[in-house]
Structure formats: structure tokens, C-alpha cells
Amino acid sequence: IPVIEPSVPELVVKPGATVTLRCVGNGSVEWDGPPSPHWTLYSDGSSSILSTNNATFQNTGTYRCTEPGDPLGGSAAIHLYVKDPARPWNVLAQEVVVFEDQDALLPCLLTDPVLEAGVSLVRVRGRPLMRHTNYSFSPGHGFTIHRAKFIQSQDYQCSALMGGRKVMSISIRLKVQKVIPGPPALTLVPAELVRIRGEAAQIVCSASSVDVNFDVFLQHNNTKLAIPQQSDFHNNRYQKVLTLNLDQVDFQHAGNYSCVASNVQGKHSTSMFFRVVESAYLNLSSEQNLIQEVTVGEGLNLKVMVEAYPGLQGFNWTYLGPFSDHQPEPKLANATTKDTYRHTFTLSLPRLKPSEAGRYSFLARNPGGWRALTFELTLRYPPEVSVIWTFINGSGTLLCAASGYPQPNVTWLQCSGHTDRCDEAQVLQVWDDPYPEVLSQEPFHKVTVQSLLTVETLEHNQTYECRAHNSVGSGSWAFIPISAGAHTHPPDE
């Protein structure tokens, strides 16, 4: 660590005095101190002498000697006071710039340590400090305003009591800058815009920041638009708003609009799309198939997407039959708006009953006219089976009727013993009927098919079973011949 001679922490001299400060180190040494006149510097290897023959109040300050080659970076310091009865203050800088919440050092150095008891900080023209100004004083450094605020950006003077009167320093301007967290915040309204040619439109681009120094512009495709800004300051933020008003839109106005704001921290931008159309439009679509099949007792949501401009003047769900004349309950229909021009309408059909199969239509109206989208809802049923014994053209025949949707397939089984249902161990014979006769097949109704099994002689210790199945389930009917006639067993419920 270098050593300073005289080896005192502070030195008090009068104006005009000769001052010699010598610094000695192991290697070469350097002096650092306030920029002031009349100093002469003489260096000789490991020592350096700073001297003046005519000390003035401007030489007041801390002089530090460092040894650049020292890896520990040690230094020694001495504080010099040049006590001028006419000049109690040496101001090292007339402008101080800090960010909000930093400590601001106003570097007015006291030239006479005796005066410390009577110092104060004031604003220029003797105005008092703003409320909540928290500051401290050090004779060797000046006044420190702690955690400076933007509002404390003022001109200050340091005051000292000399012989009963206050003597002021020259003024120091403090600039407290807002801490800018990033580029300005942006909004662009609306997020999307549609207009018919000839209508009026408005697009609003606004940006805000804690600091006034930022730019904002609205760009159409690649053209910067010349729009006068409206500026405001509220909630401790500066706001700039650009409003594009178009009295009569044309196709040239369509396209991409970008709201761009920039400051020292960077740039933000946000975009929207403006569509200009020739006339009103109303488009209905669904991501679902318009032909729906659902198992009876289950639920279904029918969804329609609507794209429209201008907005809808009316809409509703209608049941078009063919069963009852019931209409969907309004509470089962709901609408959600995805954005200004797109909506989703949903009809909820819980626990579907047979009478609710049929056509459901969504109708919507706007100035462009009426549009409808119709769903066809068919219910799926597991097969219901019945078997009877009859004679056809003199031949004994088992007749199986199966009803369900989708159309059931029919299989006959002959098994030993009397049973409600043939199992694999008992089966004697199996016949598949690939083409049962379709007795009825109306839209939205069950399909009824009939299958015939010609039996020359009914074996009395056997069971004949008709089984029907479709994608929903299966059903069966067991026919047991009895000497006194025939006995049938429907499936257990």
C-alpha cells in the first residue's frame, strides 16, 4: 500500500499557502483528485509529488494515491481543506444525473471543516427542499440525497453559516431519470377490423412509458402513416395515442396495421388486420359432420361457427321433425364469441330420446340475409329380436324379426338341450343370414329386418336361437319346441 506524506487524514491550509503531497510506493504511483488549478506533478520512480505554491478554495478535495501494479489495488488518501473565508464551498460538478432510487451525490465540498455544524441544502432562490427529501452531509463529499425521486429533479444550492449569515454555493442541477424497464407498452384497437366499402373506420394505436422520450407510429403494410398524436400524463406514465379515422374506407385501406413504439430500451410492435369487403356477409360452418349418429340415451352437442359482418340481428335453433313438434329448449343453446366477427353457437342435447332424432337447423340473420345449417341426427339402437314358428308354403319355418340401428346382422344357432341362450359347448349348428329381408327402413327410424329358417322337423330336445347384432349391441330370442307346441324365450333383461 502506498504511503502519503504528510501522514495525516486531512490537512487544513489557508489560501495562497504552499502545499506539497508526496506519495511513495513499491512501484510507480499515480495521483487522483478533483480537477483544480495550480498543481504541479513530479514523478520519480516509486514516488510522486503533487505541489502548489498558491492553494485556492478550488484545491479543496480528497487526493488519492494508487499503485497501478499492486494486485491488491491498495491506495492511500488525504483530504485537503483550503479554508477561504469568502468561499465556503468548492463545487466539483454543476450537473448530476442519476436514476430513480439511486443516491444522488451533490458534490459541494466544504472548504473549512469548522463550518460543518451550520450547513444545509436548499433549492435555488432559497426555496425549501421538497417534502420527504432524505439527505445526509459529508464535508469531504457533499450532500447525498438518498433514493432520489423523479420529482426531485431540481436546482440545488449548498448553504453554510459564516459569521451569522448564510453563504450559498453555485447551483447544482440534479436530473433524476426514470428507470425505464423496457420498450413502451402498446395497445392496438381493434385486434381485427372488417368494414364494408364506404363505411367509416377507426384504428387506435397507443403507447405508454414512465419516460417521455419515446416514439410511436402506426404503419399500414410498409407505409408509416402521418397521424397527429394525443399526449397525456396520468398514473405516472406518459401516454401517446394515434387515432386513424377513415370516413369512407376503400380496398386500398385493407391490410396489415402495425403499432410500433420505441425508446432507448428497444422497440415493441403489435399488429392487426383490416378487411374491406364489398357487401355484408354471413357464413355458417361446422367442424362436425352434418350427419350425426348417436346411441339413444347418450348426449350430443351440435356446434355451428358463424362468421358475419355486420353483426347478427337474430339467430335460433329449430327442430324440423319428423317426430314430435317439440323445439329445443333455449337453455340448451348457448353462444360464445371468439372475437368480433366470429361466434360459436352450441345446442346441447343430453340423454337423447327416440323422439329427438331428426333434423336440427341453425338459422342466423344479418343485413346480408338469412343463412341456415342443418344437422341430421339419427339415433343408434341395439337390436330387439322376436321369433315365431309358422308355415310358409307348407314348410315349417322359424321367422326372426330384428329391429335396431344400424341395420342388424342375423345369425341362427341350433343347440342341444333347452336353454335361454346357446353357449359354445352346446352349439350343434350355426347359420349366418347375410341378406335378411328389410321390412322397414325410414330415415331416423330403426331398421327392421326379417330372417327365415326353414326347419323340416323341430327337434324337441333342442333350442333354436336367433341372434342379431350391430355396432351398438346385440339381442337374441331362444325358441324351444315343446311337444304341446312351441315355447319362446326372449332374452333376459
Epitope: 417521455v212 416514439d215 407510429f217 399500414h220 407505409t223 408509416k224 402513416l225 402521418a226 397521424i227 397527429p228 398524436q229 394525443q230 399526449s231 397525456d232 400524463f233 386513424l244 379515422n245 377513415l246 370516413d247 369512407q248 376503400d250 385501406h253
Partner: antibody, heavy 123, light 107 residues
Framework: EVQLQQSGPELEKPGASVKISCKAS????????MNWVKQSNGKSLEWIGN????????TYNQKFKGKATLTVDKSSSTAYMQLKSLTSEDSAVYYC????????????????WGAGTTVTVSS | DIQMTQSSSYLSVSLGGRVTITCKAS??????LAWYQQKPGNAPRLLIS???SLETGVPSRFSGSGSGKDYTLSITSLQTEDVVTYYC?????????FGSGTKLEIK
């Protein structure tokens, strides 16, 4: 030479409408926004609004919304201002003024002015 | 709206002398201020924009200064043709507003 030539004086009855014109020459008409300024009887100046001749965008001083309508005819490099429902309060000299420093920046001072159109409203 | 106040409606001046015209904004306008000169029966003429920038062709005896809310137009070596009315205008925020004007008169 950059010039803005305004239409002649107008004498109108209360309740009537008037449309005054401002023909631009010596520069690209669509490149600079056109502003309109009112000066009542030697008094101060009031900004009415502006129009972007290329794009058609308008900005009005709220005080003149509904009173003034700004339009342009690009083919003849002419800007128009229509004043409706005239009253004696509308008697004034109306100037068209070109916005200076066209660069998409936000500077809205007026570097070229028309000579003014005097509108007198009297029964 | 931002109000622009020109505190002196009239100022008595001496030819060859110096005059300072003041303009105060009701809010901070970030130096977005223009000065205009208007001769009787004529349209206003732009002298200064950006509070300090002299327009091309405007004599150097005109100068502008100020910041924040307070601005001044100074004319040195006053000529006869300068004894007219001067307006300030802010273009920081719409609606753009003008001061009420300061008319110079020879003492």
C-alpha cells in the same frame, strides 16, 4: 414554387352550408397532410383538423366535429372543407396550411399557408 | 387540451432594440413548439419549429429558446417589418393549440 390557392370570399345565411377549397401546386399533394385553421376577426388561431390526401385519414378538433367535414380530390390536388349549419360564430377567415417535415414523424407545424377564405354569415 | 398563454398581448418596442416574447404551456410539451409571424391581412408565416430551429429564409435576428412549459422568441436589432403579431403553437398533443398572440408596437 409551393403554393396553396384558396377559393374566394363567401357570404352565407344562417343555417346554410358552405364548401371552401384549397388547390395545391408546386409539390406532391398526396405527400403532405393538409390542415385547416380558423381565425375569427383578428383574434387568435384555432386548429380545425387535418386530412391525409393520400390515405384519406382525418383528425378533427373535437370542437369542430360535426361542424367541419374535410375531403380531398387527388386528381385536382385540391382539399375541401365544408361547414354546415352556419351561425354568426362561424364568421371568420379560414386558412388551409400544409404540415411541414413530411416523414411519417410527429411534427405538426405548418410551413405553407393559403391566403385565407373569408366566410361571413349574415341574415 | 393544452392551453398556450402569451402573457403580453401588446409589447412596446424600440427599433434596433431587442424584444423577448414569452409563451407558457399548461403542460409539458417536450419542445414541440412553433412560432409564427402574422402581418395584417396576411396568413401566418412559420419562423421557428422545435422551439429553436430557424426555418430557411428567416433572418438570424430571430431565435427561439425554452424547454418543458416555458418558451421564448427573441428578436434582436428590431426592424420596422418585425413590428407585427407573433403566435406560438404546440404540436405535442391534439388538438393543436395556438397562443393568443403578442402584437409589437413602436414606443
Amino acid at each position: 414554387e409551393v403554393q396553396l390557392q384558396q377559393s374566394g370570399p363567401e357570404l352565407e345565411k344562417p343555417g346554410a352550408s358552405v364548401k371552401i377549397s384549397c388547390k395545391a401546386s408546386g409539390y406532391s399533394f398526396t405527400g403532405y397532410n393538409m390542415n385547416w385553421v380558423k381565425q375569427s376577426n383578428g383574434k387568435s388561431l384555432e386548429w380545425i383538423g387535418n386530412i391525409d390526401p393520400y390515405y384519406g385519414g382525418t383528425t378533427y378538433n373535437q370542437k369542430f366535429k360535426g361542424k367541419a367535414t374535410l375531403t380531398v380530390d387527388k386528381s385536382s390536388s385540391t382539399a375541401y372543407m365544408q361547414l354546415k349549419s352556419l351561425t354568426s360564430e362561424d364568421s371568420a377567415v379560414y386558412y388551409c396550411a400544409r404540415r411541414g417535415d413530411y416523414s411519417g414523424s410527429s411534427y405538426w407545424y405548418f410551413d405553407v399557408w393559403g391566403a385565407g377564405t373569408t366566410v361571413t354569415v349574415s341574415s | 387540451d393544452i392551453q398556450m398563454t402569451q402573457s403580453s398581448s401588446y409589447l412596446s418596442v424600440s427599433l434596433g432594440g431587442r424584444v423577448t416574447i414569452t409563451c407558457k404551456a399548461s403542460d409539458h410539451i417536450n419542445n414541440w413548439l412553433a412560432w409564427y409571424q402574422q402581418k395584417p391581412g396576411n396568413a401566418p408565416r412559420l419562423l421557428i419549429s422545435g422551439a429553436t430551429s430557424l426555418e430557411t429564409g428567416v433572418p438570424s435576428r430571430f431565435s427561439g429558446s425554452g424547454s418543458g412549459k416555458d418558451y421564448t422568441l427573441s428578436i434582436t436589432s428590431l426592424q420596422t417589418e418585425d413590428v407585427v403579431t407573433y403566435y406560438c403553437q404546440q404540436y405535442w398533443s391534439t388538438p393543436f393549440t395556438f397562443g393568443s398572440g403578442t402584437k409589437l408596437e413602436i414606443k
